[in-house]
């Protein structure tokens, strides 16, 4: 039950996070005009990863896309790439995790397969979240650097426009959305990895099997296992028989890859 809840919560948190990463990537307000030096400006500038916008006093808003690819700064390209990689990984992770959900039955899929898929999606969410956080942080660093370089005719690094002294840019709403969304995706991924450990195949109770020796009759009783939490290795669960006979249900217990996160 706890495993299902952890997995379900991890999925929901990651879903919200990835939706946030997509929203942040599409938002125009990655950087907004700093009004500290010019609070009376009637023209408000803000810029995104894909276009820059100007909102005029009349209420008219004009946005222009960055139609050049080669003319854009490498940093901006890197941020775009990180965000897109984050979205793609997150989307694949979501797709995988849907099939991995314990509450959803798909044919005769074994728990081991679901555990593998849960771990895979968890790792994808973690990488997706890290990509988003990295992308937003790189952009934020770029803004901070440019903020203090507000000399006349400064190259802004955003669409290659000439910057006049009075226009400086500060953090936009998209940065905060991106940081929060990346964090949520990361948390969701960790939760999926934790849930995966609980989904790892456990050793089941053994059927009582009687072996008739030629001389006298010896019955081997099944071992009484301690209750397992689902976390950690089951190698400590000692069997109370010492016969060499093995049932078809008994599997040798080695630490699996799901035991260590």
């Amino acid at each position: 039950m706890a495993v299902t809840a952890c997995q379900g919560l991890g999925f929901v948190v990651s879903l919200i996070g990835i939706a946030g990463i997509i929203a942040a990537t599409c938002m125009d307000q990655w950087s907004t005009q700093d009004l500290y030096n010019n609070p009376v400006t009637a023209v408000f500038n803000y810029q995104g990863l894909w276009r820059s916008c100007v909102r005029e006093s009349s209420g008219f808003t004009e946005c222009r896309g960055y139609f050049t690819l080669l003319g854009l700064p490498a940093m901006l390209q890197a941020v775009r790439a990180l965000m897109i990689v984050g979205i793609v990984l997150g989307a694949i992770g979501l797709l995988v995790s849907i099939f991995a959900l314990k509450c959803i039955r798909i044919g005769s899929m074994e728990d081991s397969a679901k555990a593998n898929m849960t771990l895979t999606s968890g790792i994808m969410f973690i990488v997706s979240g890290l990509c988003a956080i990295a992308g937003v942080s790189v952009f934020a660093n770029m803004l901070v650097t440019n903020f203090w370089m507000s000399t006349a005719n400064m190259y802004t690094g955003m669409g290659g426009m000439v910057q006049t002294v009075q226009t400086r840019y500060t953090f936009g709403a998209a940065l905060f959305v991106g940081w929060v969304a990346g964090g949520l995706t990361l948390i969701g991924g960790v939760m999926m990895c934790i849930a995966c450990r609980g989904l790892a195949p456990e050793e089941t109770n053994y059927k009582a099997v009687s072996y008739h020796a030629s001389g006298h009759s010896v019955a081997y009783k099944p071992g009484g296992f301690k209750a397992s939490t689902g976390f950690g290795s089951n190698t400590k669960n000692k069997k109370i028989y010492d016969g060499g006979a093995r049932t078809e249900d008994e599997v040798q217990s080695y630490p699996s890859k799901h035991d260590y996160v």
Partner: antibody, heavy 119, light 113 residues
Framework: QVQLVQSGAEVKKPGASVKVSCKAS????????MHWVRQAPGQGLEWMGM????????NYAQKFQGRVTMTRDTSTSTVYMELSSLRSEDTAVYYC????????????WGQGTTVTVSS | DIQMTQSPSSLSASVGDRVTMTCKSS????????????LTWYQQKPGKAPKLLIY???TRESGVPSRFSGSGSGTDFTLTISSLQPEDFATYYC?????????FGGGTKLEIK
Amino acid sequence: QVQLVQSGAEVKKPGASVKVSCKASGYTFTSYWMHWVRQAPGQGLEWMGMIHPNSGSTNYAQKFQGRVTMTRDTSTSTVYMELSSLRSEDTAVYYCARRYYGSISPDYWGQGTTVTVSS
Amino acid sequence: DIQMTQSPSSLSASVGDRVTMTCKSSQSLLNSGNQKNYLTWYQQKPGKAPKLLIYWASTRESGVPSRFSGSGSGTDFTLTISSLQPEDFATYYCQNDYSYPFTFGGGTKLEIK
């Protein structure tokens, strides 16, 4: 057809207040800022401030801060400009204007309201 | 506040003449975000409300004859009437549309010679 119809001429005594109205028609009243501009006899144009009919948010020129109040009534699509503590130098023609350029919508101005401040 | 200075304050010309008037602002009206100059030109005839001619320093308002053209960037702007018509005799105002308050220039009165 867009129309801005202003109230009639006013004669006021110094120290009094005047409230000029501007009734809009032919467009979505709440979508555009309304500006107030005045012109003293034989003088140039002077921007007083603006109001957004939807939110009621205003922006006044520092010169008129504390003396001017711009309000709106969305039910009648009317904006009002009230100027208090009138002085003789407030004698002017007061215009309301719906300013929205940068699109297919042009500028529209009211016909003007003459306010005379005289003792 | 941004100060707007127009010159000359009055100008005499004949029908068919090419006329140029200037407007200087105390601060740059160029917005780096879209590389547009937020300067507007108005025409006003006696007893009438102003009429928008040009916005963004050089963009003609719809319905305004092509003989009117605006140019300039930053702090220096020009309004040119290529061939004066009788209906063009009026007062012309430039206006800062970049920062509050939206200050107007003193105006240039265009009279018949």
